[in-house]
């Protein structure tokens, strides 16, 4: 498990003639936001595949109004990083789509209008844990500058975040109340599935399903500190050289989660797990009903019988949690054989097989391709005496000689109009929907299929 992080540095007119002055105007002030979609890069899935590695939406940037006659400044951007958590292994090679969206804040009927300003896409190689990589992409007359990296979430380590490390002897090596020493390379071992929610920093397990706490931590999920003593023990300052780290004030100190929410530390901050009926960063928002759209990922909301549970979310396959906000990690059962990489797509499990293997669970051993050629950059896979080409984007047929029809499967949802494009396909979304495949509804009341999705597009104009 880990997080892909994207930092947008600038978005504006690119160099050269014909560049637009600004996406906003004096008559129509606007603000920008960004969406990133990640896919496994060496995937055999078609261009219209979902964002299998995940997607994220930024906050909206500051309002910008073009000043007539003034030189075009850099456009104000939303604060913070775009973070895309991934549950499975980091694939190393990935494809990205970054969309720049504009919210127009004029006096339109039905609220602000949304439009896609630019979409850039690419395929990159990136090892988890590496430094920030910088990139510049152009879309038409626009230029986007950004950096990105992938980092593992403890206890995962390695360039693919597939090795889980925990200090076996941490409790004895570190004194009471101290964080465990940095895990050593030889103390990594095969993944163990601890109890759900067990703190990755302060808990560990010897057996699947248990959650044992390091000294200084308690609670069923090892999230409650016992004491805050330091490495300077009564025996004198020498113990400060043992490699133990003194914890500063923890982000969960004083429990910032309101309304009975439980706090767990994350590498950068904290996370509140809220009781049903409450949500928000600190569980501060209450009185939620089905009208508030609390069920994510297509969950079905049903009004609760008692006041303390104003609603119940019935989650679709692949999701769990009181708001269907958590993805079920069905890959923990390691269904893919022969070293195949497991992808949980929500509606189904998919195995991405290593070279030489095929089948739904990578169970078939293939012969090599014996020099058979696939056209237009396709790669050859052979099994049972017959070779098959895995074609590059935009091509199909037995030998990848035919131009593929990327719109054949009607990939644009909710009335979106599909166009074949040099990069595969592009969707023109009907008002009220957004995303690379028009998959995200944007509701006028601000609730959305994405927790952070923006408020509604203007309703469609009636045809006369």
């Amino acid at each position: 498990a880990g997080v892909f992080e994207l930092q947008i540095h600038s978005f504006g007119p690119g160099p050269g003639p014909g560049a637009p002055r600004s996406p906003c105007s004096a008559r129509l002030p606007c603000r920008l936001f960004f969406r990133v979609c990640l896919k496994p890069g060496l995937s055999e899935e078609a261009a219209e595949s979902p964002c299998a590695l995940g997607a994220a939406l930024s906050a909206r940037g500051p309002v910008y109004t073009e000043q007539p006659g003034a030189p075009a400044p850099d456009l104000p951007l939303p604060d913070g990083l775009l973070q895309v958590p991934f549950r499975d292994a980091w694939p190393g090679t990935f494809s990205f789509i970054i969309e720049t969206w504009r919210e127009e804040l004029g006096d339109q009927i039905g609220g602000p209008a949304w439009s896609l300003l630019a979409r850039v896409a690419g395929r990159r190689r990136l090892a988890a844990g590496g430094p920030w990589a910088r990139d510049i992409q152009r879309a038409g007359a626009w230029e986007l500058r950004f950096s990105y990296r992938a980092r593992c979430e403890p206890p995962a380590v390695g360039t693919a975040c597939t090795r889980l490390c925990r200090p076996r002897s941490a409790p004895s090596r570190c004194g009471p109340g101290l964080r465990p020493c940095a895990p050593l390379e030889d103390e990594c071992e095969a993944p163990l599935v601890c109890r759900a929610g067990c703190s990755p920093e302060h808990g560990f397990c010897e057996q699947p399903g248990e959650c044992r706490c390091l000294e200084g931590w308690t609670g069923p999920l090892c999230t409650v500190p016992v004491s805050t003593s330091s490495c300077l023990s009564p025996r004198g300052p020498s113990s400060a050289t043992t490699g133990c780290l003194v914890p500063g004030p923890g982000p969960c100190d004083g429990n910032p989660c309101a309304n009975g929410g439980s706090c767990s530390e994350t590498p950068r901050s904290f996370e509140c797990t809220c009781p049903r009926g409450f949500y928000g960063l600190r569980c501060e928002v209450s009185g939620v009903t089905c009208a508030d759209g609390p069920c994510f990922n297509g969950g079905l909301c049903v009004g609760g019988a008692d006041p303390d549970s104003a609603y119940i979310c019935h989650c679709p396959p692949g999701f769990q949690g009181s708001n269907c906000e958590k993805r079920v990690d069905r890959c923990s059962l390691q269904p893919c054989r022969n070293g195949g990489l497991c992808l949980d797509l929500g509606h189904a499990l998919r195995c991405r097989c290593r070279a030489g293997f095929a089948g739904p669970r990578c169970e078939h051993d293939l012969d090599d391709c014996a020099g058979r050629a696939c056209a237009n950059g396709g790669t050859c896979v052979e099994g049972g005496g017959a070779h098959r080409c895995s074609c590059a984007l935009g091509f199909g047929g037995r030998d990848c000689r035919e131009r593929a029809d990327p719109c054949a499967a009607r990939p644009c949802a909710h009335g979106g109009r599909c166009y074949a494009h040099f990069s595969g396909l592009v969707c023109a979304c009907a008002p009220g929907y957004m995303g690379a495949r028009c998959e995200f509804p944007v509701h006028p009341d601000g609730a959305s299929a994405l927790p952070a999705a923006p408020p509604g597009l203007r309703p469609g104009d009636p045809q006369r």
Epitope: R403, C407, A408, R417, C418, A428
Partner: antibody, heavy 123, light 111 residues
Framework: QEQLVESGGGLVQPEGSLTLTCTAS?????????MCWVRQAPGKGLEWIAC????????TDYANWAKGRFSISKTSSTTVTLQMTSLTVADTATYFC???????????????WGPGTLVTVSS | QVLTQTPSPVSAAVGGTVTISCQAS????????LAWYQQKPGQPPKLLIY???SLASGVPSRFKGSGAGTQFTLTISDLECDDAATYYC????????????FGGGTEVVVK
């Protein structure tokens, strides 16, 4: 060179039917966006009729007034037809075939047109 | 959905400037999905401007589109004899389906 040519126009009786054909050369429909029909009555303005996806999905869009009497279909990777029924004198026009492409997040951009074929409805 | 073009006809001398207005009864898709076409007698229309203000390939920069939402303008500067033609605006909309409508056309006479 990319080209569109319409055929099938001519004189037809009121209440009659006619099928127009649009043939492409220099490109294939599946590699483009949508193929559309637009008409223009003598001395009048342009009027959009219908579009069909260039790909195999066959998705169609019609002007409200054209639904029921007009039918667009793709007969091959380079031909599109427009079937017209219950024709009236008001349908007398030059019928153009046009290609609709996606450019910079906008659609219904007709960047390639045929020369047109004249349909005359008269008794 | 109605697109109203004014004025028609419009005339100007060679080297002059003409401005054609296109008023939509409701906002076009994405506020900018409006195109301009030029049509000469006996010929099919030719795409000049897309996305309200972007110049189509091969079109001289004397043609300039502007506007958003419901109000759009085509400006032709440094008029040439060859610019004499009828100009149409075309808007795109969505209401339970995609559709497009054209304005009534504006004839430009070059003196």
């Amino acid at each position: 060179q990319e080209q569109l040519v319409e055929s099938g126009g001519g004189l037809v009786q009121p209440e009659g039917s006619l099928t127009l054909t649009c043939t492409a050369s220099g490109f294939s429909f599946s590699s483009s966006g949508y193929m559309c029909w637009v008409r223009q009555a003598p001395g009048k303005g342009l009027e959009w009729i219908a579009c069909i996806s260039g790909g195999s999905s066959g998705d169609t869009d019609y002007a409200n007034w054209a639904k029921g009497r007009f039918s667009i279909s793709k007969t091959s990777s380079t031909t599109v037809t427009l079937q017209m029924t219950s024709l009236t004198v008001a349908d007398t026009a030059t019928y153009f075939c046009a290609r609709d492409v996606y450019i910079d997040s906008t659609i219904f951009n007709f960047n390639l047109w045929g020369p047109g074929t004249l349909v005359t409805v008269s008794s | 959905q109605v697109l109203t073009q004014t004025p028609s006809p419009v005339s100007a001398a060679v080297g002059g400037t003409v401005t054609i207005s296109c008023q939509a009864s409701q906002s076009v898709y994405n506020n900018n999905n409006l195109a301009w076409y030029q049509q000469k007698p006996g010929q099919p229309p030719k795409l000049l401007i897309y996305a309200a203000s972007s110049l189509a390939s091969g079109v001289p920069s004397r043609f300039k589109g502007s506007g958003a939402g419901t109000q759009f303008t085509l400006t032709i500067s440094d008029l040439e004899c060859d610019d004499a033609a009828t100009y149409y605006c075309q808007g795109t909309y969505y209401s339970s389906g995609w559709y497009s409508t054209f304005g009534g056309g504006t004839e430009v006479v070059v003196k």
